[in-house]
């Protein structure tokens, strides 16, 4: 807390400008009007304030807006956002994607902080669902964002948003998450066909049931090993040797290198040795 002291004569700030960097903390507290600060927040980022000075500015805004900052202020917080606690952010009502982008930009290049996680949570809850534009924005800043959500949270993702998902956005998703995303992807891409469809759905196949894999095995898809290794073990186990051979096409030779890893290892153990021998890869069941 900064003590309440009168502003020295002639030091009353009429605008937020570079002269303020020479103010001591108590002078900032006494001489900068909170309402002025709020209307000129966009100028704060252009001025090289110290962390201690930023603390004072935050304190002034907190006093002016005890129930939480309005979006007009939030959008221009800039580096002052890094001073906010999750508790501060929970008071906010952020509805504009532009505001979200502006604040994510401040944290760019860093891991997702608790502040950012809280901000995103507030934003998504305010929107009611994770729409395509929001997902586009979030995955651009945090490629692992989608996989950080629980299956319950993912269930609120509308199928139309799936178009914004890139393969790398799914790299860290576990089977439970892909179980939720796969039906959404099927719905999103259902009017595509041929190789175009397979390219789009491929990243989501970790949530595919056995029946879909069996159907694909009859359609010359030539699934790569990286995709095969991400399939659900329980979906792969019922596949016959012939089905896996047709599913992988020329990539079937890659099974040898993966024979000790799931789901290949578990699948091999389920097969008759005679059937495995037809592949000519030396796989031992």
């Amino acid at each position: 807390e900064v003590e309440k002291t009168a502003c020295p004569s002639g030091k009353k700030a009429r605008e937020i400008d570079e002269s303020l960097i020479f103010y001591k903390k108590w002078e900032l507290e006494a001489c900068v009007d909170a309402a002025l600060l709020a209307t000129q927040m966009d100028r704060v980022n252009a001025i090289p304030f110290t962390y201690e000075q930023l603390d004072v500015l935050k304190h002034k805004l907190d006093e002016l807006y005890p129930q939480g900052y309005p979006e007009s202020v939030i959008q221009h917080l800039g580096y002052l956002f890094l001073k906010m606690s999750p508790e501060d952010i929970r008071k906010w009502n952020v509805t504009s994607l532009e505001t979200l982008k502006a604040l994510l930009e401040v944290n760019k290049g860093h891991e997702m902080s608790p502040q950012v996680a809280t901000l995103i949570d507030r934003f998504v809850k305010g929107r009611g669902q994770l729409d395509k534009d929001t997902l586009d924005t979030l995955t651009a800043f945090y490629p692992g964002y989608l996989c950080s959500l629980s299956p319950e949270e993912l269930s609120s993702v509308p199928p139309s948003s799936i178009w914004a998902v890139r393969p790398q956005d799914l790299d860290t998703c576990d089977p439970r998450q892909l179980d939720v995303l796969y039906p959404k992807a099927r719905l999103a891409f259902q009017n595509m066909n041929g190789s175009e469809y397979f390219v789009k759905i491929q990243s989501f196949l970790g949530g595919a049931p056995t029946e879909d894999l069996k159907a694909l095995s009859q359609q010359n898809v030539s699934m790569d090993l990286a995709t095969f290794m991400k399939l659900r073990t329980d979906a792969v186990l019922p596949l016959t040797v012939a089905e896996v051979q047709k599913l992988l096409g020329p990539h079937v030779e890659g099974l040898k290198a993966e024979e000790r890893h799931r789901p290949v290892r578990d699948w091999i153990l389920r097969q008759r040795q005679d059937d495995l021998d037809t592949l000519g890869l030396g796989l031992q069941g």
């Epitope: 891409f189 009017n191 066909n193 041929g194 469809y197 069996k214 694909l216 009859q218 359609q219």
Partner: nanobody
Framework: QVQLVESGGGSVQAGGSLRLSCAAS????????MGWFRQAPGKEREGVAS????????YYDDSVKGRFTISRDNAKNTLYLQMNSLKPEDTAMYYC?????????????????????WGQGTQVTVSS
């Protein structure tokens, strides 16, 4: 997963009509195939008619062309087979089936081995 339940079978005189229905529950997508198959006692199961759910493709076996019509009500998630001018040789157990993913419409041809979801069947008996 898709569950298929047929209804509408029964006994009819030659020349009569029947309409079979197949209610699908679970996830049905445009790039799936649905079709009708039949199996007469002592015979192999054979394809009757099939379609691409998203439209643009229907197939009929030569033996039913001009007499049977396959259709689908998307809102009700139901597949139909309208059978007119029935003959005694149409007597069989009729099955509704689906392919869970079709990369091309032509893959929907009613080939038994391609279809991976099946209903329990409904009996159709045509007497002369």
């Amino acid at each position: 997963q898709v569950q298929l339940v047929e209804s509408g079978g029964g006994s009819v005189q030659a020349g009569g009509s029947l309409r079979l229905s197949c209610a699908a529950s679970g996830n049905v997508y445009n790039n799936m195939c649905m079709g009708w198959f039949r199996q007469a006692p002592g015979k192999e199961r054979e394809g009757v008619a099939s379609m691409y759910v998203g439209g643009g493709y229907t197939y009929y076996d030569d033996s039913v062309k001009g007499r049977f019509t396959i259709s689908r009500d998307n809102a009700k998630n139901t597949l139909y087979l309208q059978m007119n001018s029935l003959k005694p040789e149409d007597t069989a157990m009729y099955y509704c089936a689906a392919i869970s993913i079709a990369l091309t419409r032509e893959f929907c041809a009613p080939i038994v081995s391609r279809y991976n979801y099946w209903g329990q069947g409904t009996q159709v008996t045509v007497s002369s």
